[in-house]
């Protein structure tokens, strides 16, 4: 979706997700998600950022990594790895604070 | 339209712990648009956010309930869950659940007490 | 944290007058992301005002935002019985998320 003009300078980014209009995307910051979910193979999505910068600096877990870039088209060819399983005792968790 | 339903036990007895789980309908809860939150309001008073979750599972607490909130989300089933353990009677109040986007907060469930009592 | 702070407390008024309700911030609203929602007895919030000044969908055009950085103001610019309830400002859009403590409007 547009991002109002009040938002400040946006960038324009790859889209690589189920829920992308196209090929390209505008927002405040470029996004790469990378997710696994239980039983499945990790699945990278590449868009827009506007909201919760906060994510950009979670640690990665062996569920999900985020990554955050602020110029044009620069989640392009960006690859994401997820942490290896750790022991319980060590799992960092996904909340970033 | 996207709605939201909060669904859960109405009563916890104290030391327990209290789990809520919000449906989100007529939409997807994996649009990398939307983070879901948790809201609540004790008897009478203001709006406590407690915190969201992405649908990548990536979430953040309000930092006074941190230690005991756990936020999860299930996207085969639509769903987002909460989770607030050792609860008291501080706890009771309306728990809501709402979608957060650039478009602040623009739906909300319809909210679901919950009583600490034993 | 971003602490707000609305005033007054309490409006008095009477319908058709012009309402004006504000919301202050303890740290500049980043990309104004500062919404506004009404909330009547026994239901949830309704958003009014997003992005400090963007009107909801199916809000009507007597309710408007407006400000930047620290302050926020929302305007009825003339009441309806129906408008009388409480309303809450809210910082969004990063973490912590805050609401203020509330005004709330009441008929004179």
């Known amino acids: 979706d547009p991002v109002k003009p009040s938002r400040g300078p946006l960038v324009t980014c790859t889209c690589e997700s189920p829920h992308c209009k196209g090929p390209t995307c505008r927002g405040a910051w470029c996004t790469v998600v990378l997710v696994r979910e239980e039983g499945r193979h990790p699945q990278e999505h590449r868009g827009c950022g506007n909201l919760h910068r906060e994510l950009c600096r979670g640690r990665p877990t062996e569920f999900v990594n985020h990554y955050c870039c602020d110029s044009h088209l620069c989640n392009h060819n960006v690859s994401l790895v997820l942490e290896a399983t750790q022991p319980p005792s060590e799992q960092p968790g996904t909340d970033g604070q | 339209q996207v709605q939201l339903q909060e669904s859960g036990p109405g009563l916890v007895k104290p030391s327990q712990t209290l789990s809520l789980t919000c449906t989100v309908s007529g939409g997807s809860i994996s649009s990398n648009d939307y983070y879901w939150n948790w809201i609540r309001q004790h008897p009478g008073k203001g709006l406590e956010w407690i915190g969201y979750i992405y649908y990548s599972g990536s979430t953040y607490y309000n930092p006074s309930l941190k230690s005991r909130v756990t936020i999860s989300v299930d996207t085969s089933k639509n769903q987002f869950s909460l989770k607030l353990s050792s609860v008291t009677a501080a706890d009771t109040a309306v728990y809501y659940c709402a979608r957060e986007s650039t478009d602040g907060m623009d739906v909300w469930g319809q909210g679901t007490t919950v009583t600490v009592s034993s | 944290e971003n602490v707000l702070t609305q005033s007054p407390g309490t409006l008095s008024l009477s319908p058709g007058e012009r309402a004006t309700l504000s919301c202050r911030a303890s740290?500049?609203?980043?990309?104004?992301?500062l919404a506004w929602y009404q909330q009547k007895p026994g239901q949830a919030p309704r958003l009014l005002i997003y992005?400090?000044?963007s009107g909801a969908t199916g809000i009507p055009d007597r309710f408007s935002g407006s400000g930047s950085g620290t302050d926020f103001t929302l305007t009825i610019s003339r009441l309806e019985p129906e408008d009388f309830a409480v309303y809450y400002c809210q910082h969004y859009g990063s973490s912590p998320i805050t609401f203020g403590q509330g005004t709330r409007l009441e008929i004179k």
């Open positions: 740290q500049s609203v980043s990309s104004n992301y």
């Open positions: 992005g400090a000044s």
